[in-house]
C-alpha cells in the first residue's frame, strides 16, 4: 500500500497574485500526475514536467507562468494507476486562489449553470470566488436566499426549482453571475426496473428487440451487455414517457440477427447520483432456420375401448409458429362428420399442445392417425395406429354332416378386437350338460378330433372342430374370448344312427 503523495508547498490552500507565476511539486513512491481546474484547451500556460532527484521518489512539477482567475481551483496529485472512472480521485490536494479585481467569480462552462437536484436533496450552486475574502450573497426572484457558502464549492442548501444569481462586491464594484437554473429530477432510493422481450426465440435474419423500463426515476444510467455489443451489433433507443408517471424506456434492437447473437441480454441500471444498481437478464436464442420437434405422450400402437372417451396429447416445439393438422388414413380429418375433435393450445413461446379427442370410440374409428406440424422451414409428422377394442361375440355356430362316414364339423364364427381366441368344450352326458362340471375342454391332441382356426378378416375369426365319428349325442360349446369379454354358444350333435331312427319314427 503506497502512502499518499505529498505536495510542496505543504498547505491546504494558497493565494497567488494575479499574473504571477507559481509552481506545485508532487512527490510519490510511484509515477504521479496532476489534475487541475482548467480543461486542456484552456491550459496552454500550464506546464507539467517530471523532475529527477536523489530521494528515490517520483517528482512531477506543475508550473503556471501567468496566473489568472481561471487558475482558481483544486489541484490534485495522484498515482497514475489508482485513477478509475467511477471513483473520486484519491490523492493530495491544494486549493489555489487567484484574486482578480475584474473577475469576482471563477469562469464556468455552460453546463455548470444547470444544477440538477434530486427531489428534496441538498445541492451546490457552484459560484466560487477568486478571492477567499470576497463576501457573496445568493438571490432568487424572491430576494436573498439563506444558504451556507464555501468559496471552494459555492452555496450549499436545499433549493426550490428556478433561477439563482450569486452576487459579490469587490472594492466597491458589484458582480453578478448569469443565472444558475435549478432543475428537479425524480429519483427514488430503489430502482424499479422491468425487462421485456416479446420474443426470446428468433431465426437468422430476424430483428431482436429487448426493452428495459425504469419507473419513477430520471437520474439513471443504463448499460446493455449482450453478445454483439463488442462488435457494435445493436442499436439503442431511449424514450421518455411522462404521463401518467415518469418512465424511461430503453430499447435495444439487433437487426438481421445471426446465430452468434444468441446468449444473455442484460440491462444494468445505475442511479446516477446514488450507488443504487439493478440488473435484469433474458436469454435469447437465434436458430439458423426454423425448426419443429414433435413429442407424443403415447406409443405408435394405441388401443381404445368401444364407447370410451380418450385423448391423445402431442407436445410440439416449433419456431416460427406451426400450422398443425390431423389426418386419418392419410385423409384430412373432417371433424364435423365424426365424434372426433382436435385442438391446439400455446403453452409457452415456442411450445404447443395438440389434442385428438375421441368422444365415444366406435369400431370405425380404428385406423392410422397422423399429426402434421409445418412452418416455412420444416415439416414433421407422427403417425400412430388406433385400434378400437370390441368385446368378442359369436356371430354363428353351425354343424356340417359328412354323410355316410358319420363325421361332423362344427363351425364357430366370432368377431372382436383384438381377434378373439376360440376354445371348444364338450359335454358327453347330454342329460347332465346343465352342470358346468360335465363340460371338458377339448384338447388339440385328441385322436379322431381335429380343431383349426382361420382369420376371416381383421376382426373376424372362424374356429372349426371336426369329429371323425359321432356315436352318441353330445353337446359342443364354442367359447370366444378376448381382453374385453367372452361369449359362448352351444350346439347338440346327434349320432347318425340316432338321426336315422328319428327320421323313420
Amino acid at each position: 500500500q503506497l502512502s499518499l503523495p505529498s505536495i510542496l508547498p505543504n498547505e491546504n490552500e494558497k493565494v497567488v497574485q494575479l499574473n504571477s507565476s507559481f509552481s506545485l511539486r508532487c512527490f510519490g513512491e510511484s509515477e504521479v500526475s496532476w489534475q487541475y481546474p482548467m480543461s486542456e484547451e484552456e491550459s496552454s500556460d500550464v506546464e507539467i514536467r517530471n523532475e529527477e532527484n536523489n530521494s528515490g521518489l517520483f517528482v512531477t512539477v506543475l508550473e503556471v507562468s501567468s496566473a489568472s482567475a481561471a487558475h482558481t481551483g483544486l489541484y490534485t496529485c495522484y498515482y497514475n494507476h489508482t485513477q478509475t472512472e467511477e471513483n473520486e480521485l484519491e490523492g493530495r490536494h491544494i486549493y489555489i486562489y487567484v484574486p482578480d479585481p475584474d473577475v469576482a467569480f471563477v469562469p464556468l462552462g455552460m453546463t455548470d449553470y444547470l444544477v440538477i437536484v434530486e427531489d428534496d436533496d441538498s445541492a451546490i450552486i457552484p459560484c466560487r470566488t477568486t478571492d477567499p475574502e470576497t463576501p457573496v450573497t445568493l438571490h432568487n426572484s424572491e430576494g436573498v436566499v439563506p444558504a451556507s457558502y464555501d468559496s471552494r464549492q459555492g452555496f450549499n442548501g436545499t433549493f426550490t426549482v428556478g433561477p439563482y444569481i450569486c452576487e459579490a462586491t469587490v472594492k466597491g464594484k458589484k458582480f453578478q453571475t448569469i443565472p444558475f437554473n435549478v432543475y428537479a429530477l425524480k429519483a427514488t432510493s430503489e430502482l424499479d426496473l422491468e425487462m421485456e422481450a416479446l420474443k426470446t426465440v428468433y431465426k437468422s435474419g430476424e430483428t431482436i428487440v429487448v426493452t428495459c423500463a425504469v419507473f419513477n426515476n430520471e437520474v439513471v444510467d443504463l448499460q446493455w451487455t449482450y453478445p454483439g455489443e463488442v462488435k457494435g451489433k445493436g442499436i439503442t433507443m431511449l424514450e421518455e414517457i411522462k404521463v401518467p408517471s415518469i418512465k424511461l424506456v430503453y430499447t435495444l434492437t439487433v437487426p438481421e440477427a445471426t446465430v452468434k447473437d444468441s446468449g444473455d441480454y442484460e440491462c444494468a441500471a445505475r442511479q446516477a447520483t446514488r450507488e443504487v444498481k439493478e440488473m435484469k437478464k433474458v436469454t435469447i436464442s437465434v436458430h439458423e432456420k426454423g425448426f419443429i420437434e414433435i413429442k407424443p405422450t403415447f406409443s405408435q400402437l394405441e388401443a381404445v375401448n368401444l364407447h370410451e372417451v380418450k385423448h391423445f396429447v402431442v407436445e410440439v416445439r416449433a419456431y416460427p409458429p406451426p400450422r398443425i393438422s390431423w389426418l386419418k388414413n392419410n385423409l384430412t380429418l373432417i371433424e364435423n362428420l365424426t365424434e372426433i375433435t382436435t385442438d391446439v393450445e400455446k403453452i409457452q413461446e415456442i411450445r404447443y399442445r395438440s389434442k385428438l379427442k375421441l368422444i365415444r370410440a366406435k369400431e370405425e374409428d380404428s385406423g392410422h392417425y397422423t399429426i402434421v406440424a409445418q412452418n416455412e422451414d420444416a415439416v414433421k409428422s407422427y403417425t400412430f395406429e388406433l385400434l378400437t377394442q370390441v368385446p368378442s361375440s359369436i356371430l354363428d355356430l353351425v354343424d356340417d354332416h359328412h354323410g355316410s362316414t358319420g363325421g361332423q364339423t362344427v363351425r364357430c364364427t366370432a368377431e372382436g378386437t383384438p381377434l378373439p381366441d376360440i376354445e371348444w368344450m364338450i359335454c358327453k352326458d347330454i342329460k347332465k350338460c346343465n352342470n358346468e362340471t360335465s363340460w371338458t375342454i377339448l384338447a388339440n391332441n385328441v385322436s379322431n378330433i381335429i380343431t383349426e382356426i382361420h382369420s376371416r378378416d381383421r376382426s373376424t375369426v372362424e374356429g372349426r372342430v371336426t369329429f371323425a365319428k359321432v356315436e352318441e349325442t353330445i353337446a359342443v360349446r364354442c367359447l370366444a374370448k378376448n381382453l374385453l369379454g367372452a361369449e359362448n354358444r352351444e350346439l347338440k350333435l346327434v349320432a347318425p344312427t340316432l338321426r336315422s331312427e328319428l327320421t323313420v319314427a
Epitope: G205, E206, T207, V209, K231, G232, K233, I235, T236, M237, L238, T251, T253, P255, E256
Partner: antibody, heavy 121, light 107 residues
Framework: EVQLVESGGGLVQPGGSLRLSCAAS????????MNWVRQAPGKGLEWVSF????????YYADSVKGRFTISRDNAKNSLYLQMNSLRDEDTAVYYC??????????????WGQGTMVTVSS | DIQMTQSPSSVSTSVGDRVTITCRAS??????LAWYQQRPGKAPKLLIY???SLQNGVPSRFSGSGSGTDFTLTISSLQPEDFATYFC?????????FGPGTKVDIN
C-alpha cells in the same frame, strides 16, 4: 445491379397526404432493414424512419411520429412511406436507404436517387 | 438524442491538397460512425463505416479515424471529383443522427 428507386413525390397542400414508394432490386430485399432519410432544400440529412426485414419493428423520428407510417411488401420488393397531416417543414427530398451491418458498425450502404416532396399552399 | 457536430462547415481548397474534417458526438459512440459524400443533386454515398473502414470501391485517399466522441475524415490528396459535401452519422442509437455537413469547394 443493386439499386433503389423512389417514386410518389410531388406537390401537396399542408394537411394533405402522400404515399412514397421505393422499389428494390439486385439483392434479397427481405434480409435487410430499410430506412427513409430526408433532406430539406439546402440543409443536412435527417433520418425519418426504420423498418426491420420482416416488418416486426418500426421506429420514427419524433418530428414525424404519429403522422408517417413505414411499411414494406417483401413479395413485391417494395418499401413505402405513408405521409399524413403534412406540414411545410416536411418539404424535402426523401431517400430510401438500406441499413447494413458491417463488422463493427451499421451504415446506409445503398441509397435511392430521392423523390421531392413539396408541401405548400 | 445524440448530437453530431462537424467542423469546419465549409473549406475552400485546391486539387492535390490534404483535407481534414472533424466530427464530434455529444456522447461516446465508440467506433460506430459512418462518413458519406454527397455531390450536388445526387444521393449520399457511403465512404467509411465503423469510423475507419473503407467501403468497397472507395479510393484509398479517403481515410477515417477516431473513437468515442472525436472523429476525423481525411482526404490525402484532393481530386476534382471530391468537391462535395461530407456528412458524418452515428449508428449506435435511434434516432440516427447526421452531422450538419462540411462543404469542400474549389479555392
Amino acid at each position: 445491379e443493386v439499386q433503389l428507386v423512389e417514386s410518389g413525390g410531388g406537390l401537396v397542400q399542408p394537411g394533405g397526404s402522400l404515399r412514397l414508394s421505393c422499389a428494390a432490386s439486385g439483392f434479397t430485399f427481405s434480409s435487410y432493414s430499410m430506412n427513409w432519410v430526408r433532406q430539406a432544400p439546402g440543409k443536412g440529412l435527417e433520418w425519418v424512419s426504420f423498418i426491420s426485414g420482416s416488418s416486426s419493428t418500426m421506429y420514427y423520428a419524433d418530428s414525424v411520429k404519429g403522422r408517417f407510417t413505414i411499411s414494406r411488401d417483401n413479395a413485391k420488393n417494395s418499401l413505402y412511406l405513408q405521409m399524413n397531416s403534412l406540414r411545410d417543414e416536411d418539404t424535402a427530398v426523401y431517400y430510401c436507404a438500406r441499413l447494413r451491418y458491417f463488422d463493427w458498425s451499421y451504415a446506409f450502404d445503398i441509397w435511392g436517387q430521392g423523390t421531392m416532396v413539396t408541401v405548400s399552399s | 438524442d445524440i448530437q453530431m457536430t462537424q467542423s469546419p462547415s465549409s473549406v475552400s481548397t485546391s486539387v492535390g491538397d490534404r483535407v481534414t474534417i472533424t466530427c464530434r458526438a455529444s456522447q461516446g459512440i465508440r467506433s460506430w460512425l459512418a462518413w458519406y459524400q454527397q455531390r450536388p443533386g445526387k444521393a449520399p454515398k457511403l465512404l467509411i463505416y465503423a469510423a475507419s473502414s473503407l467501403q468497397n470501391g472507395v479510393p484509398s485517399r479517403f481515410s477515417g479515424s477516431g473513437s468515442g466522441t472525436d472523429f476525423t475524415l481525411t482526404i490525402s490528396s484532393l481530386q476534382p471529383e471530391d468537391f462535395a459535401t461530407y456528412f458524418c452519422q452515428q449508428a449506435t442509437s435511434f434516432p440516427f443522427t447526421f452531422g450538419p455537413g462540411t462543404k469542400v469547394d474549389i479555392n
